[in-house]
Structures are given as structure tokens and as C-alpha cells.
Amino acid sequence: GITSINCSGDMWVEPGEIFQMGMNVSIYCQEALKHCRPRNLYFYKNGFKEEFDITRINRTTARIWYKGFSEPHAYMHCTAECPGHFQETLICGKDISSGHPPDAPSNLTCVIYEYSGNMTCTWNTGKPTYIDTKYIVHVKSLETEEEQQYLASSYVKISTDSLQGSRKYLVWVQAVNSLGMENSQQLHVHLDDIVIPSASIISRAETTNDTVPKTIVYWKSKTMIEKVFCEMRYKTTTNQTWSVKEFDANFTYVQQSEFYLEPDSKYVFQVRCQETGKRNWQPWSSPFVHQTSQETGKRNWQPWSSPFVHQTSQTVSQVTAKSSHEPQKMEMLSATIFRGHPASGNHQDIG
């Protein structure tokens, strides 16, 4: 664009150099050339000469009018045709921008990843604004009334060291640009309720050579949280439907989960956990692929009547991937309950 240009005159924009996309815009060019009474004044947009909607206002000034200007950025310049000059003479130039006022930030979420030392807040920014837009994150203690503000562009990490005076906070986000400001809804945060346990990792899996082979999946976490609720989902690599098993876990030792699976098949396993009774889940762990061994004796394998082990498994349900290209995006289709209480309704955010 044009940032530093020696002008022999002036160029100005109505309603302003940054305006709302879709507005009608007038751009004026006024020459102040020495030894030139211009025959014509010309406008250029992004280097291309404009031909329409140009009005000569008087000897020194011309205007170009744009109906519903909808380009996010353009650089404009104007020139004069001076008698006796072979080339046009530059008068002035301006960068212009159009955009939108921000939408109100939505889906504000704040979590503390265990051991991170930060509260991470994220939100949906809404539609693109096309112009510089900042987010002011307000964090107000409900106990001391002290308010802190943080500037962000899409998310913010706030050191928990600066949140030591209180456990309860009100958090909200203001989206601001030169065209407007909008506030998110306020989020009530209790620091003890937003901790996400340290990442859960599937370390290995093995299939036994028993008459009825079983697969044991080993998984662990460095979490110090005592009561943790976890889900493990698994499926064959050729299938779109995941089965989900739920566990109450105690990570003072490596977890072992037993599965009766189809022989000679490649399975994918993933696990995620949350503090029991809280609402924030870990992201699903990296996919762990395991090949079950070949069938040794003949038997009828019935996947949905297989004996699930005595572990703290509560429910098994099925979810189906929306697309084979997006294995992380899941949608609850049905829940098949094997024992214990029904699924807790948390499956809508699987993925």
C-alpha cells in the first residue's frame, strides 16, 4: 500500500479511510501542483485507472464515487494530466479499508490445564471483520472486586500467579475495532472447577493368547487429581462407528482396560478424562493403533454380547464419525447400555 508518499495536493475519503463494508464511498482528489493547470484528474485503484463515476468539482478538485464498496483493502491514488507533460503527474495516494464491526464474542470458555500455570480463555470471534480487531478480556474477582484487563487477538493465557487473591471470578470479553465494540456474556469461573487433568496417554496394548483372546490397553496420566472420570473410544480402522467405554480412574498406577475384540483387526483407541463431576474434558489423546492377533480356535464372535470385565466400566455406547476424513468430529447416534447407569449426556462434545 501507500504509506509515505510526497503529495502535491490532498486526497481524502468520506466517510473515512476505514469504513463499513458495503457503504457508499466518495474519494476526493485536490491538486496543488506548481506550473500546471490540469486538463484532467485521474483516479487509480490498486494501480488500475478508473473510468466511471468521476466528477470534476472545480479546477483543482475531482471526486470518484463507489456504490457499496466491498473490498477489504485498496490503495487509491490520483494523477493530473498537465499540458506539455508526456506523463501524468502524481498528486496523492491513500490506503483505504472496509470491514465490519465485531460480533459479540460467544462461547467463552476458560480452563486451567493442570501444571500449565495459566488460565486459558478462548471464544468464538464471529464473522471476519477484515480490519484490526482486538479483544479486551476482563477478569474481575467476585471476592475483592479487583478487575484486571488483558489484550488479546484470539485467546488469552493468564498466569494463575495473578489470580491468587481469589478463587471466584467473573470473566467477559469485549471485541473492539474502529467500527464498534461488542461484549460477550459474562462467565462465572471458580478456579477449582476448571482444571483439566494432565494429558492421558495410551502407552501400549497387548492381546492375550487365551481361548477367548482379550486385548489389554495400558494408559496413564501424570495428574494429581484423585477423582477422574475417563472415556475410551475404539473402533476398527475400517469402521466409522466408535464404541465408548467409561471409567472411574485412579492414576496412582497405570490403568489397564480389557476389551474383547474382533480377531485379526486393526483397532484405533483414544482416551480423554475430566475431573469427576466437572464439565471440561481433555482433548482426545493421540490415536493409538493396535492389531489384534489371528483367531486360533473356531468360535462365533459376537461383538455386542462380549463379556466386559469387572473393571469400573459403567457404560458402552456407539458414536459415528460424520466423515471418514474427520475422525475427531463425532456425533452421538445411539447409546447401548451394558451395565450401570445410562451415559451421562457428555457425548455431544466428543471430538
Epitope: 479511510e17 476505514i18 479499508s97 480490519i131 484490526d132 482486538k134 479486551i136 484486571q148 484487563q149 488483558y150 489484550l151 488479546a152 487477538s153 488469552v156 493465557k157 493468564i158 495473578s162 475495532n177 474502529s178
Partner: nanobody, 116 residues
């Protein structure tokens, strides 16, 4: 760390004008997104005006057309020209240095009182 010092507040009749100044010292001033904020008694601290990296400026609806933000980079100083002042503009005015991901740093503030 940036230090900010506001000045220029005072008492004025409705319809009058004031020019607030905010002088910044410290080596990280260049990374600041500078803004003017105000806080009336018992209210939140609200953004009045902020300048963006593209050179554009935000003004709160309540001050549009009356207040003008300007800056003098050579002096590390920003200004808020306040015209046509109203009683509802009465507040403590603060300038703030905001850098991405960091807590906003405030000056001590300067009191503006507009009487009718």
C-alpha cells in the same frame, strides 16, 4: 516495564473543553496498544478510545464526534482532546498500555469533573 502519567484533568462547565495528556516512559512503549479509559464512581472501567495498528481509532458511542485521540510518538505521549463536555463525562480518566497477552498497565489517573 512501561510507566504512564496522566495530566490535564480538572473541573469545567458543561460545553467546555479539556485536553488530557499521558506521558509514557520505559523501553516497551513501542509495543503498546494505547487507550484512554474512564471510571465513574461505582462503575466498571470503560474503554473510551483506542488506537489500532492500522492507524484507525475506536471511540465509544457516547464520545463520538466530541473526543479526539492523538499521539506524538517522538515524545511517547498520547492525548485525548475532549470538547462539548457533558456532566456524564465526569469520571477518573486513565491511559492504558495494552500488549498482547499481558495485563493492561494503567497510569494513576486524572480526575475530570463537568458541572452543569
Amino acid at each position: 516495564q512501561v510507566q504512564l502519567q496522566e495530566s490535564g484533568g480538572g473541573s469545567v462547565q458543561a460545553g467546555g473543553s479539556l485536553r488530557l495528556s499521558c506521558a509514557a516512559s520505559g523501553d516497551t512503549y513501542s509495543s503498546c496498544t494505547m487507550g484512554w479509559y474512564r471510571q465513574a464512581p461505582g462503575k466498571e472501567r470503560d474503554l473510551v478510545s483506542m488506537v489500532f495498528s492500522d492507524g484507525s481509532t475506536f471511540y465509544a458511542d457516547s464520545v463520538k464526534g466530541r473526543f479526539t485521540f492523538s499521539q506524538e510518538n517522538a515524545k511517547n505521549t498520547v492525548y485525548l482532546q475532549m470538547n462539548s463536555l457533558k456532566p456524564e463525562d465526569t469520571a477518573m480518566y486513565y491511559c492504558g498500555c495494552a500488549t498482547l497477552g499481558s495485563r493492561t498497565i494503567w497510569g494513576q489517573g486524572t480526575q475530570v469533573t463537568v458541572s452543569s
